[in-house]
């Protein structure tokens, strides 16, 4: 049979997902119901590996599968009739498959830094990069991330800095390729904690009796993490700035003369049965010298006529020595200290003085 050459196809339409493209086209020849169509699909930059699809007669659509996400392709469509008589020119169309979303990403806190490290494996296929969005309340930040390669299963990471401590952030990462955006991948991550900011003031110390004092102080600001505990520290020595080293000393050490500074009382804030908001500052009043015990610390009677200063340690993380039961491990804890109070001098023991006078 004799056939005239088919005219070229036109109006090529493409709809894509990550790994497939559905193509449809038109041919306006009267004889088009007798045509089949030959499709050549070529990945950009890879002409040696073209995929060929031939449709059944009269069919003007085709779905091509096993494509690579986020990649650019060109399709050429020839109309053909009889024994391979093809249209002079193919219809041509460039298209991109949709980029693949990131499967998931993990967050890691950075110890003692207001930052998060995000880690992910590259999604399959090609990408031009990623959009990163970080949001918490009214604050938000959008930034671009560089592209990655999925070929070797490498773990990629980025550090998100200039955040707040102990704060929950909504994080979203969107894959971009060929000007297309995948569905975003989301996670909620919370930043870590660090030493609390030291308070401006110092505790207030007042004499109650010849062997006890009252220490009043305000709760530390919780912007670096929730305050987990307070330690009340007494000294009879020079009131320099305390260090974490003093946390190991007890009333017993003081009595033995091993140290002129010791921890007399420990407050675990969880025991108060209430959560403390960032702006809420609690007031504390501690009776020092009442012979109570908190964990490994004995709140022993003070020396009459002694001169004492008080300081408060606040903890966002309190760690105890594994071998020294109930004693704080200062090096492993997140702690800061108030300044020492002014000194208070205790009165003499009136009863003892009276007894001495009669002898």
């Amino acid at each position: 049979a004799q056939y005239t050459r088919p005219s070229n196809v036109s109006n090529i339409d493409v709809s894509t997902n990550t790994t497939a493209a559905t193509l449809s086209w038109q041919n306006f020849d009267d004889a088009s119901p007798t045509y089949s169509y030959c499709l050549l699909i070529e990945k950009a930059g890879n002409s040696s590996n073209a995929t060929q699809v031939v449709t059944d007669i009269g069919i003007t659509d085709a779905t091509v599968t096993e494509l690579i996400p986020g990649s650019s392709y060109t399709v050429e469509i020839f109309a053909q009739v009889g024994d391979g008589i093809k249209s002079l020119e193919p219809g041509r169309k460039s298209f991109c498959t949709d980029p693949a979303s990131m499967a998931s990403f993990d967050c890691e806190v950075v110890p003692k830094e207001p930052a998060l490290v995000l880690k992910w494996t590259c999604p399959p296929g090609a990408n031009a990069g990623f959009e990163l969005e970080v949001s918490s309340g009214a604050w938000n930040n959008a930034t671009h991330l560089e592209s990655c390669s999925s070929e070797n299963g490498t773990e990629y990471r980025t550090e998100v800095t200039y955040l707040n401590f102990s704060t929950s952030y909504n994080i979203s990462i969107t894959t971009v390729s060929c000007g297309k955006m995948a569905a975003p991948t989301r996670n909620t991550c919370t930043t870590g904690i660090t030493d609390p900011p030291p308070p401006d003031g110092s505790p207030n110390i007042t004499s109650v009796s010849h062997n006890s004092v009252k220490v009043k102080f305000s709760g530390f600001e919780a912007s670096h993490g929730p305050i987990k505990a307070y330690a009340v520290i007494l000294t009879t020595g020079e009131a320099g700035h305390p260090s974490a080293d003093v946390l190991k000393y007890t009333y017993e050490d003081f009595k033995k003369g091993a140290s002129d500074t010791y921890v007399t009382y420990l407050i675990r804030t969880e025991e108060k049965g209430r959560s403390q908001s960032l702006s809420e500052v609690l007031k504390y009043e501690i009776d020092v010298g009442n012979e109570s015990t908190t964990l490994g610390y004995y709140n022993g009677k003070l020396e009459p006529l002694g001169s004492y200063r008080a300081c408060v340690a606040g903890f966002t993380n309190i760690t105890f020595h594994p071998q020294n039961k109930g004693l704080i491990d200062g090096a492993e804890s997140y702690v800061s200290f108030s300044r020492y109070s002014d000194a208070v001098s205790l009165p003499q023991d009136v009863a003892a003085a009276h007894h001495h006078h009669h002898h």
Epitope: E133, H144, S172, G179, A183
Partner: antibody, heavy 117, light 107 residues
Framework: EVKLVESGGGLVQPGGSLKLSCAAS????????MAWVRQAPTKGLEWVAY????????YYRDSVKGRFTISRDNAKSTLYLQMDSLRSEDTATYYC??????????WGQGTLVTVSS | DIQMTQTPHSLSASLGETVSIECLAS??????LAWYQQKPGKSPQLLIS???PLHDGVPSRFSGDGSGTQYSLKIRNMQPEDEGVYYC?????????FGAGTKLELK
């Protein structure tokens, strides 16, 4: 096929308000960062506002901050720009656009806003 | 704000000629540089994003190059349909900023 169609432009007096809309089709609107770009008559292009996909965070150029509000309705695949306290220097053709990785990829045909007394 | 200085302001080229448009950013923009073509009465069209990848359907006679602060758009084999105004734009930092444009005419 990606299609963006702006509407809502017109003539408004200084100090007045207008709300522009941009109807999107042919792509998954909710996945995309979107933006408004404007072009004053016979002038160059100027980015106006930008909105993210996940949390709808908005960013503005300084000259429109506090006067313009960008928003989106993913269910309707529509982007909006509420323009208040309009000034003569806001006179321009306003385009909506998709904006992955900081590039304005697909553009609408634009809608003309004229601020004049 | 990052300033984008585009040169030349205008140029005319003969059919088949190669033309180049330069764009200088006032600070490094990590290749977040796009090029657009705009014809009279039409919306701008993206040609190139991320300094060099061609957008879908853009003829291969267009190419982008550059890094850091200096970028260029090259058009080989000038065609009548290439007439128009060309803009560069940085998408690295808010506010996103455009060059002032280069008007390309056919000689």
């Amino acid at each position: 096929e990606v299609k963006l169609v702006e509407s809502g432009g017109g003539l408004v007096q200084p100090g007045g308000s207008l709300k522009l809309s941009c109807a999107a089709s042919g792509f998954t609107f909710s996945n995309y960062y979107m933006a408004w770009v404007r072009q004053a008559p016979t002038k160059g292009l100027e980015w106006v506002a930008y909105i993210t996909n996940s949390f709808g965070s908005a960013y503005y150029r300084d000259s429109v901050k506090g006067r313009f509000t960008i928003s989106r309705d993913n269910a309707k695949s529509t982007l909006y720009l509420q323009m208040d306290s309009l000034r003569s220097e806001d006179t321009a053709t306003y385009y909506c656009s998709t904006v992955p990785l900081g590039a304005f990829v697909y553009w609408g045909q634009g809608t003309l806003v004229t601020v004049s007394s | 704000d990052i300033q984008m200085t585009q040169t030349p302001h205008s140029l005319s080229a003969s059919l088949g000629e190669t033309v180049s448009i330069e764009c200088l950013a006032s600070e490094g923009i990590s290749n977040y540089l796009a090029w657009y073509q705009q014809k009279p009465g039409k919306s701008p069209q993206l040609l190139i994003s991320h300094a060099n990848p061609l957008h879908d359907g853009v003829p291969s006679r267009f190419s982008g190059d550059g890094s850091g602060t200096q970028y260029s758009l090259k058009i080989r084999n000038m065609q009548p349909e290439d007439e128009g105004v060309y803009y560069c734009q940085q998408g690295y930092k808010f506010p996103y900023t455009f060059g002032a444009g280069t008007k390309l005419e056919l000689k």
